[in-house]
Interface confidence: medium
């Protein structure tokens, strides 16, 4: 029979034949042959694999480093990674929670909608058209663009969400 060009779900193609993938929590030891099944082994104590796979090494569980203010929220299993969270009163800097801050700063282009409290982190909002923020800050709101007209000037460079407009003198040559 013709060798397969594609395999079923939870299988992979190798040496012109379809082998079973290893289930989550197990790694590949050896590919299947005409006569033998795929050989898989469970991941070790501090390791995991979270998908059907053909990986020869399991991934290490994430380390929740107390020096970064992290602690374990949910212990990893052979099929899931460890989930870290921050110590009481601290907040994750990202969804992956790789480090902690007392309160998060809003990046340039974003302003503070609500300053952090003891229990809630800073709430940031994108600066709308007509406003900008050029700093990373845990406190500053978006600032309105400078109004060139009120200074009897004209816009020389348009503003963005991260920069103010640049005003310049009116062109006196106009009739």
């Amino acid at each position: 029979p013709e060798p397969p060009t594609a395999c079923r779900e939870k299988q992979y193609l190798i040496n012109s034949q379809c082998c079973s993938l290893c289930q989550p929590g197990q790694k590949l030891v050896s590919d299947c042959t005409e006569f033998t099944e795929t050989e898989c082994l469970p991941c070790g104590e501090s390791e995991f694999l979270d998908t059907w796979n053909r990986e020869t090494h399991c991934h290490q569980h994430k380390y929740c480093d107390p020096n970064l203010g992290l602690r374990v929220q949910q212990k990893g299993t052979s099929e899931t990674d460890t989930i870290c969270t921050c110590e009481e009163g601290w907040h994750c800097t990202s969804e992956a929670c790789e480090s902690c801050v007392l309160h998060r700063s809003c990046s340039p282009g974003f302003g503070v909608k609500q300053i952090a409290t003891g229990v809630s982190d800073t709430i940031c909002e994108p600066c709308p058209v007509g406003f900008f923020s050029n700093v990373s800050s845990a406190f500053e709101k978006c600032h309105p663009w400078t109004s060139c007209e009120t200074k009897d000037l004209v816009v020389q460079q348009a503003g963005t969400n991260k920069t103010d407009v640049v005003c310049g003198p009116q062109d006196r040559l106009r009739a």
Partner: nanobody
Framework: EVQLLESGGGLVQPGGSLRLSCAAS????????MQWVRRAPGKGLEWVSA????????YYADSVKGRFTISRDNSKNTLYLQMNSLRAEDTAVYYC?????????WGRGTLVTVSS
Amino acid sequence: EVQLLESGGGLVQPGGSLRLSCAASGFTFEWYEMQWVRRAPGKGLEWVSAISGDGYRTYYADSVKGRFTISRDNSKNTLYLQMNSLRAEDTAVYYCAKELAFFDYWGRGTLVTVSS
């Protein structure tokens, strides 16, 4: 190397005043928002106050609003906290901080004790 050195703490009676200073070095001081944070005995860290890099905008925790004043002198790379009408609950180690990240740049702190 970034360094922050607080001073000005001490023992003061309720209702008294103190002025804390924080001498900064190793970074471009005026580029950064600076903060005061405190840790009361047996408690977690509490954010106290912050000031924008240019010194024009200031922010305070409700617990100190109207009593504490944050300021900075960018020509001297120094941050200040003027503390008036001190209360027993203001007793804490006060830290100045360049950033509020857990692992980032903090001073060693200065102890303020409010007691009669």
